[in-house]
Interface confidence: low
């Protein structure tokens, strides 16, 4: 079980490497993260260290209301701040591990 | 005003090639993925084509696939389908679509521009 | 391909009429639905996305529901202005981006 988590950790953080690079890998990012209410990999924070990311921005599907360039200057009070692998992790250890 | 103005419809013979150019005002038009959608005479809407907002990724439908290309330039705020090969069954009003690739709906549609193909 | 079937394909209502059209998928695309608008010789207009939120400056009377594989618009008082035909779009799995067949509202 760890071993499947800590591997969802690297992927996650990975694909999140390629997300301005992919389309595909965005679409999957965008909606685990508007699906899972979640954003980056620990948390929202994790979309500075992208370099291909502009600055002051996440994807819109980390807002609470997502709108279009909802994530470009985003206020912190607007966006959901837990990380992906912690509560995609939980679903999984819950209802499939 | 946020706008989207395609141009280069017109009558064509089968087999023979057009390029439709949809000029892009109002927005940042590199933040955005462009599609190009079609309706047939008395038809529904078919999606025919997308390209991602840096130009390095396009889907095909299958219907196209092998005839058109989509290509854009973000210098110019602007994209282009270029077709080939083409069939009496092209014939349709061809619509450039922004979309917000957030899977939130394609909120930005052109007038769109008539393709007539036909001897 | 995720197919997206609508019904009814035609109806006919009256001004202030509560009128309801549904899509269903052919599979599960939890809530990536869409609804647009569509009047004779003009462009699609996007009225309702994520099956849900309504698109800015869209009238509160259109409204959408559902998720999963079934999803509703619903128009609680028709207005002159909206006999046109609706579709339904789905934006879960894309490619390929997939619409539903139209349902054309006419007056009755």
């Known amino acids: 079980r760890d071993k499947v988590m800590s591997e969802f950790n690297n992927n996650f953080r990975q694909q999140m490497e390629n997300y301005p690079k992919n389309n595909h890998t965005a679409s999957i990012l965008d909606r685990m993260q508007a699906d899972f209410k979640c954003c980056g990999a620990a948390n929202y924070t994790d979309w500075e260290k992208i370099p291909s990311m502009s600055k002051n921005r996440v994807p819109d599907s980390c807002c609470i209301n997502v709108t279009v360039g909802c994530g470009i200057n985003f206020n912190e009070k607007a966006i959901h701040k837990e990380g992906c692998v912690e509560k995609i992790g939980g679903w999984l250890r819950k209802n499939v591990l | 005003q946020v706008q989207l103005v395609e141009s280069g419809g017109g009558l064509v013979k089968p087999g023979g090639s057009l390029r439709l150019s949809c000029a892009a005002s109002?927005?940042?038009?590199?933040?955005?993925?462009m599609n190009w959608i079609r309706q047939a005479p008395g038809k529904g809407l078919e999606w025919i084509t997308y390209i991602n907002n840096g130009g390095y990724t396009k889907y095909y439908a299958d219907s196209v696939k092998g005839r058109f290309i989509i290509s854009r330039d973000n210098t110019k705020n602007s994209v282009h389908l270029q077709m080939n090969s083409l069939r009496a069954e092209d014939t349709a009003v061809y619509y450039c679509v922004r979309d917000p690739r957030m899977y939130y709906g394609m909120d930005v549609w052109g007038q769109g521009t008539t393709v007539t193909v036909s001897s | 391909d995720i197919q997206m079937t609508q019904s009814p394909s035609s109806l006919s209502a009256s001004v202030g009429d509560r009128v309801t059209i549904t899509c269903r998928a052919s599979q599960s695309i939890s809530s990536y639905l869409n609804w647009y608008q569509q009047k004779p010789g003009k462009a699609p207009k996007l009225l309702i996305y994520a099956a849900s939120s309504l698109q800015s400056g869209v009238p509160s009377r259109f409204s959408g529901s559902g998720s999963g594989t079934d999803f509703t618009l619903t128009i609680s008082s028709l207005q002159p202005e909206d006999f046109a035909t609706y579709y339904c779009q789905q934006s879960y799995s894309t490619p390929p981006i997939t619409f539903g067949q139209g349902t054309r509202l006419e007056i009755k």
């Open positions: 109002g927005f940042t038009f590199s933040d955005y993925y």
